[in-house]
Interface confidence: low
């Protein structure tokens, strides 16, 4: 089941998935001046069996200049109204899949891909938040959001994160347009236990996104 909307936004923060649940789709988007090859996939799909998950299809981009036709716009499958956008992180170390059956690693880059990746998440997906450069977190530990199905509707749980400017002492940030929404104590349903290897501090996560998925205690 696809999640109906985007993960919540948080002022001055970005989110990132460490691994992608089976059923997740990634749009095959090309950078400016390039387009999907005519017979190419619209999206990559995380599929798998009980022991192994991987991305089906391969995105391929080709130079727009090689054809005299108008630029091709990637059509969206009809049911995918909402677009989940994450900026490319590079270099990227995928999470250890041994600890997360039923999940795909971050797909490897393809030639001439767009600078942003647009994912279509499924129920059960967890994403992790970090403050953008120049801001620090006013909370301890991870901030995550999980796409859950409640009463037949999908929704993302609320991450616990407030990001404040490092130099600010008396004024709370917010005068400039935030990049991203709500914060607070995670709701009880966010106590989603996922096996963990090692959780560094969030600033390290922001630097390399190499952190493994971690167990979260509902506080």
């Amino acid at each position: 089941e696809l999640c109906d909307d985007d993960p919540p936004e948080i002022p001055h923060a970005t989110f990132k998935a460490m691994a992608y649940k089976e059923g997740t789709m990634l749009n095959c988007e090309c950078k400016r001046g390039f387009r999907r090859i005519k017979s190419g996939s619209l999206y990559m799909l995380c599929t798998g069996n009980s022991s192994h998950s991987s991305w089906d299809n391969q995105c391929q981009c080709t130079s727009s200049a090689t054809r005299n036709t108008t630029k091709q716009v990637t059509p969206q499958p009809e049911e995918q109204k909402e677009r989940k956008t994450t900026e490319m992180q590079s270099p990227m170390q995928p999470v250890d899949q041994a600890s997360l059956p039923g999940h795909c690693r971050e797909p490897p880059p393809w030639e001439n891909e767009a600078t942003e990746r647009i994912y279509h998440f499924v129920v059960g997906q967890m994403v992790y938040y970090q403050c953008v450069q120049g801001y620090r977190a006013l909370h301890r530990g991870p901030a995550e959001s999980v796409c859950k199905m409640t009463h037949g509707k999908t929704r993302w749980t609320q991450p616990q994160l407030i990001c404040t400017g490092e130099m600010e002492t008396s004024q709370f940030p917010g005068e400039e347009k935030p990049q991203a929404s709500p914060e607070g104590r995670p709701e009880s349903e966010t106590s989603c236990l996922v096996t963990t290897t090692d959780f560094q501090i969030q600033t390290e996560m922001a630097a390399t996104m190499e952190t493994s998925i971690f167990t979260t205690e509902y506080q």
């Epitope: 919540p8 936004e9 002022p11 006013l138 909370h139 301890r140 530990g141 609320q158 616990q160 407030i162 404040t164 002492t169 004024q171 709370f172 940030p173 917010g174 005068e175 347009k177 935030p178 929404s181 709500p182 914060e183 607070g184 104590r185 709701e187 205690e217 509902y218 506080q219």
Partner: antibody
């Protein structure tokens, strides 16, 4: 079950001080930002002060800046609001709340009356 | 500070009615908006966060929408237990600020 229980309210004369406490249970207090919100009788709500999980960052509304001090004791899972130089316009029910801007959990509130 | 103006300040409606409450910011609040319900003698409780996300445990008859400076709380079918005062609150800029409230009563 999350519980926030405020105490320390009552009647106080203008210019005097009062300290409110909020005892928290049901979640790991030291991991979460906290705030005080107040509501004057028959009036709206206003955010008074905010404190980060570790107490390093505090924010105040302008009208209380320099008079009120928010603090916390993570070992005791208690939030405080020290109110000095109290004014009649500080008369209100004071609520402690979790989660910074979200106000997800609230205490039952404690009444502070500033009057001579 | 960002001023949040709610309308109407008082609302009377019948059980089963669709009710809408409006909230307007003095400047763009970027969808960083919560809605609270406060019953007489009780602390507020949050219904909606981030403009349109329903708080866990809140009935689905409550919904939120809006963007920029204009936001709406909708109760799709009013129930007797919905009698309360409703507040919006922005959190895009400190100090976070509430609207003046909308008192909802039954006809």
């Amino acid at each position: 079950e999350v519980q926030l229980v405020e105490s320390g309210g009552g009647l106080v004369q203008p210019g005097r001080s009062m300290k409110l406490s909020c005892a928290v249970s049901g979640f790991t207090f030291s991991n979460h930002a906290m705030a005080w919100v107040r509501q004057a009788p028959k009036k709206g709500l206003e955010w008074v002060a905010y404190i980060s999980y570790d107490g390093d960052n505090t924010y105040y509304r302008d009208s209380v800046k320099g008079r009120f001090t928010i603090s916390r004791d993570n070992a005791q899972s208690t939030l405080y609001l020290q109110m000095d130089s109290l004014r009649s316009e500080d008369t209100a029910t004071y609520y402690c709340t979790t989660g910074g801007n979200s106000g997800y959990d609230w205490g039952q509130g404690v009444m502070v009356t500033v009057s001579s | 500070d960002i001023q949040m103006t709610q309308s109407p300040s008082f609302l009377s409606a019948s059980v089963g009615d669709r009710v809408t409450i409006n909230c307007k910011g003095s400047q763009n609040v970027n969808k960083f908006l919560n809605w609270y319900q406060q019953k007489l003698g009780e602390a507020p409780r949050r219904l909606i966060y981030g403009t349109n996300s329903l708080q866990t445990g809140i009935p689905s008859r409550f919904s939120g929408s809006g963007s920029g400076t204009d936001y709406t709380l909708t109760i799709s079918s009013l129930q007797p237990e919905d009698v309360a005062t409703y507040f919006c609150q922005q959190y895009t800029s400190w100090p976070w600020t509430f609207g003046g409230g909308t008192k909802l009563e039954l006809k």
